[in-house]
Interface confidence: low
């Protein structure tokens, strides 16, 4: 007996071939001997089976002795043995229909679990193997689970169902809802405008929800809500914003915030959360702000940074085109009685400059100039 595997919702074509290459009488029946369809001369006739409106054949092939049974919009319960009667012969084809679905929405938040459920006909014992977009393989029986979805799990999952040495392939598009970056850090000189961007790692037709940026300034004892906003069909509208600092927010995606100027009291870490409509849980992105200030007070030239710096970052003060006068893994460095000239304050990581501020030291009878 020939075995054919089909996919729920798809169309299958079961073949039946006569030895004579001409149109002769044929019938397709199910295992209960109920007629599905056949012919009467050049006309297609249908029986009383439950497939009635979904069954068809290809009349163009009858003259070649081919009498296929086409079943559209396959259902699991269409799994059966189908019998083609032609030229006093009987050809049997066993059709097994499988379905594979994500048990929840196919749009899932980062960190959530994905469960794929296989629908199969009674008596079958299929095995399933799925390959994620990042190449990870998972195997299982009736259900497959992936916990802690990551951004790289977004895309097409390819699942192969194996039964009777035959296989059928399913493709399921999974969208992991997340920000492109889990964390970002912005380095700015005091007084500069700060741009925070929160690009999403997915695109959907309509995006609705609400969000908030909480900020923990390094100098503050507790965190503070800087801004709350609504998102409706990808349009952003601000609900509430603090007076200090007065953030501006872009009205389109990607989410974009502008801080008029970087000041030491703003240096710190923020957490932007986005709650999407009809989803449990929130998207998160951490953002950090490091602010640098170079000052000269009397005979002391000081360079300071505020905000979440790593212990391996180096802070240096150097006269332009000269060796560093002072270089420390600290958040403040200074030089007493600096000589006149253009001094550079540098924050660097393994030799790579992250932030630079220049200050001009004038001869002792003048006041310093900050370019």
């Amino acid at each position: 007996k020939k075995v054919v595997l089909g996919k729920k919702g798809d169309t299958v074509e079961l073949t039946c071939t006569a030895s004579q290459k001409k149109s002769i009488q044929f019938h397709w029946k199910n295992s209960n001997q109920i007629k599905i369809l056949g012919n009467q001369g050049s006309f297609l006739t249908k029986g009383p089976s439950k497939l009635n409106d979904r069954a068809d054949s290809r009349r163009s092939l009858w003259d070649q002795g081919n009498f296929p049974l086409i079943i559209k919009n396959l259902k699991i319960e269409d799994s059966d043995t189908y019998i083609c009667e032609v030229e006093d012969q009987k050809e049997e084809v066993q059709l097994l229909v499988f379905g594979l679905t994500a048990n929840s929405d196919t749009h899932l938040l980062q960190g959530q679990s994905l469960t794929l459920t296989l629908e199969s006909p009674p008596g079958s014992s299929p095995s399933v193997q799925c390959r994620s977009p990042r190449g990870k393989n998972i195997q299982g029986g009736k259900t497959l689970s992936v916990s802690q979805l990551e951004l790289q799990d977004s895309g097409t999952w390819t699942c192969t169902v194996l039964q009777n040495q035959k296989k059928v392939e399913f493709k399921i598009d999974i969208v992991v809802l997340a920000f492109q970056k889990a964390s970002s850090i912005v380095y700015k000189k005091e007084g500069e405008q700060v741009e925070f961007s929160f690009p999403l790692a997915f695109t959907v037709e309509k995006l609705t929800g609400s969000g908030e940026l909480w900020w923990q300034a390094e100098r503050a004892s507790s965190s503070k809500s800087w801004i709350t906003f609504d998102l409706k069909n990808k349009e952003v509208s601000v609900k509430r914003v603090t007076q200090d600092p007065k953030l501006q927010m872009g009205k389109k995606l990607p989410l974009h915030l502008t801080l008029p100027q970087a000041l030491p009291q703003y240096a710190g870490s923020g957490n932007l959360t986005l709650a999407l409509e009809a989803k449990t849980g929130k998207l998160h992105q951490e953002v950090n702000l490091v602010v640098m200030r170079a000052t000269q007070l009397q005979k002391n030239l000081t360079c300071e940074v505020w905000g979440p710096t790593s212990p391996k970052l180096m802070l240096s003060l150097k006269l332009e085109n000269k060796e560093a006068k002072v270089s420390k893994r600290e958040k403040a460095v200074w030089v007493l009685n600096p000589e006149a000239g253009m001094w550079q304050c540098l924050l660097s990581d393994s030799g790579q400059v992250l932030l630079e501020s220049n200050i001009k030291v004038l001869p002792t009878w003048s006041t310093p100039v900050q370019p």
């Epitope: 509208s237 872009g250 974009h256």
Partner: antibody, heavy 118, light 108 residues
Framework: EVQLVESGGGLVQPGGSLRLSCAAS????????MHWVRQATGKGLEWVST???????YYPGSVKGRFTISRENAKNSLYLQMNGLRAGDTAVYYC????????????WGQGTTVTVSS | EIVLTQSPGTLSLSPGERATLSCRAS???????LAWYQQKPGQAPRLLIY???SRATGIPDRFSGSGSGTDFTLTISRLEPEDFAVYYC?????????FGPGTKVDIK
């Protein structure tokens, strides 16, 4: 330098058609809402049409069904196709840019004059 | 349609004086969506205030905006000679994005 330059204005008979163009430069055109605003001599500003970044379009009742706004991002161009023109459509037509960060029209062209008269 | 009414129609003041312009909406407008523009004869309008109270880039701090709901105000703390012009409010929240009829500030 951010700039908007309108063209295509002129004299047209009632019932006639005209197509206005606006050439944008100095900014990422595709990222911004764009507008047409008109002003009859000695009168106030009247909003005519808006096209969003996704191609979504908005019109007041006075021009709906007669005017069509469109954009060609590859050419940094905004258009206004005006059909069934009436004497009341006579005005200076300004092309304008909606700001990316907030709701407000922050860049305006110098305008092109449309006169509908027999 | 949201109808914006501006008052007074004309405001006659001298340089150095304070100007208070009103914009009233026929229904509530989110303050995020309210803007003020200045227009001088023969010129295109210029954005002054967005979000009801935020000054646009390059606008002097003598211009300030306030208000919420249906009542909004543009204040010019000390009129300079270059401030004599027509001022329009606009709501950019609900289509049609209507303008007010304008208030003309002229020299007394």
């Amino acid at each position: 330098e951010v700039q908007l330059v309108e063209s295509g204005g002129g004299l047209v008979q009632p019932g006639g058609s005209l197509r206005l163009s606006c050439a944008a430069s100095g900014f990422t055109f595709s990222s911004y809402d764009m507008h047409w605003v008109r002003q009859a001599t000695g009168k106030g500003l009247e909003w005519v049409s808006t096209i969003g970044t996704a191609g979504d379009t908005y019109y007041p009742g006075s021009v709906k069904g007669r005017f069509t706004i469109s954009r060609e991002n590859a050419k940094n161009s905004l258009y206004l196709q005006m059909n069934g023109l009436r004497a009341g459509d006579t005005a200076v037509y300004y092309c304008a840019r909606g700001n990316y960060f907030y709701y407000g029209v922050d860049v305006w062209g110098q305008g092109t004059t449309v006169t509908v008269s027999s | 349609e949201i109808v914006l009414t501006q008052s007074p129609g004309t405001l006659s003041l001298s340089p150095g004086e304070r100007a208070t312009l009103s914009c009233r909406a026929s229904q509530s407008v989110s303050s995020s969506y309210l803007a003020w523009y200045q227009q001088k004869p023969g010129q295109a309008p210029r954005l002054l205030i967005y979000g009801a109270s935020s000054r646009a880039t390059g606008i002097p701090d003598r211009f300030s905006g306030s208000g919420s709901g249906t009542d909004f105000t543009l204040t010019i703390s000390r009129l300079e000679p270059e401030d004599f012009a027509v001022y329009y409010c606009q709501q950019y929240g609900i289509s049609p994005f209507t303008f007010g009829p304008g208030t003309k500030v002229d020299i007394k």
